[in-house]
Interface confidence: low
């Protein structure tokens, strides 16, 4: 993959940008699309062949304070008879999101962005079989 | 999480709520964790509700690359490797926070943005609607 040869120069910083101290950035935590809602199919965590439960984690020094994590209920998957089939595996599906962490150091408060790995749900997979020689 | 006790002599500044605008250290904690779902696992191929990953790119956003899942089938893959339409492949969606440049193109000025991403797919029993 080569850099294409088209007439466009390096990105230049606009003059209208707010001044920011070195080593930091200005972050507005008034969220764009704050009221957007997830339109997932109903109760998929219970109807899935790899069902999961939700746990809410709470941290007042994190923004957002509430982060929901999923945990797979079974090692195997649920078959058509409603029984656990251990020839298949329930595995977590994960996604990264950003949070803002508030840190107290003496009387000063600082803010740090942090990537958090959220388990979103589970899926049923065929296991990888390792053959021992 | 752990609440860090404050020095009682400190002025009470935004104790409960976060201020609307904050100055944040440029280094993101856990920034270099590998977030390419194609590299981190092959669940998207091995799942009974397999999905394809589509690259969504926006240079005005961090992260600039987000992978969107699209279920390959309406049904799920059965033990014989065929699509079983008695079951449904459905996307698992998640709201995530990203950074949006504000004003546009500025190097160190951002606003949090909530976006909805499909992370993967799962196989579910369909909801059957009986017609009276």
């Amino acid at each position: 993959r080569k850099i294409p040869k088209v007439g466009h120069t390096f990105f230049q910083k606009p003059e209208s940008c707010p001044p920011v101290p070195g080593g930091s950035m200005k972050l507005d935590i008034g969220i764009i699309n704050e009221n957007q809602r997830v339109s997932m199919s109903r109760n998929i965590e219970s109807r899935s062949t790899s069902p999961w439960n939700y746990t809410v984690t709470w941290d007042p020094n994190r923004y957002p304070s509430e982060v929901v994590q999923a945990q797979c209920r079974n090692l195997g998957c649920i078959n058509a008879q409603g029984k656990e089939d251990i020839s298949m595996n329930s595995v977590p599906i994960q996604q990264e999101t950003l949070v803002v962490r508030r840190k107290h150091q003496g009387c000063s408060v600082s803010f740090q962005l942090e990537k958090v790995l959220v388990t979103v749900g589970c899926t049923c997979v065929t296991p990888v079989i390792h053959h021992v020689q | 999480g752990i609440t860090i006790p404050r020095n009682p002599g400190c002025p009470n500044s935004e104790d409960k709520n976060f201020p609307r605008t904050v100055m944040v250290n440029l280094n993101i904690h856990n920034r270099n964790t590998n977030t390419n779902p194609k590299r981190s696992s092959d669940y998207y191929n091995r799942s009974t509700s397999p999905w394809n990953l589509h690259r969504n790119e926006d240079p005005e956003r961090y992260p600039s690359v987000i992978w969107e899942a699209k279920c390959r089938h309406l049904g799920c893959i059965n033990a014989d490797g065929n699509v079983d339409y008695h079951m449904n492949s459905v996307p698992i969606q998640q709201e995530i926070l990203v950074l949006r440049r504000e004003p546009p193109h500025c190097p160190n000025s951002f606003r949090l943005e909530k976006i909805l991403v499909s992370v993967g797919c799962t196989c579910v029993t369909p909801i059957v609607h009986h017609v009276a």
């Epitope: 080569k2 294409p4 | 590998n34 390419n36 961090y62 992260p63 440049r101």
Partner: nanobody
């Protein structure tokens, strides 16, 4: 890319990457390297609109990434080179604000220049 070559441990090299342009406003430029039999790893990255560069822990204090907007050129000054720095070095460009040292964040790649450090 240019500027690669063979050097003794403790020596220096300066890599250059001349870019002709982009299909969209490129925000990140980075240097990556790949040693034989190893995965490609990020070395250093810079946001072309300003701000602090990022470095892999293994090169901090020894390598410096810089840019010359007038010449549309990216540089990597490599000092105190070690045998473990031996690799093919690639220049890369892509979008994104933080310019992380993760290769799939970068869309455009150079052909690479070989750096060999002998003890």
């Amino acid at each position: 890319e240019s500027g690669g070559g063979s050097v003794q441990a403790g020596g220096s090299l300066r890599l250059s990457c001349a870019a002709s342009g982009w299909t969209f406003s490129t925000l990140c430029m980075g240097w990556f390297r790949q040693a034989p039999g190893k995965e490609r790893e990020g070395v250093a990255a810079i946001y072309t609109g300003g701000g602090s560069p990022y470095y892999a822990d293994s090169v901090k204090g020894r390598f410096t990434i810089s840019q010359d907007n007038a010449k549309n050129t990216l540089y990597l000054q490599m000092n105190s080179l070690k045998p473990e720095d031996t690799a093919m070095y690639y220049c890369a460009a892509g979008g994104g604000g933080y310019c992380p040292l993760i290769d799939y964040e970068y869309n455009y790649w150079g052909q690479g220049t070989q750096v060999t450090v002998s003890s």
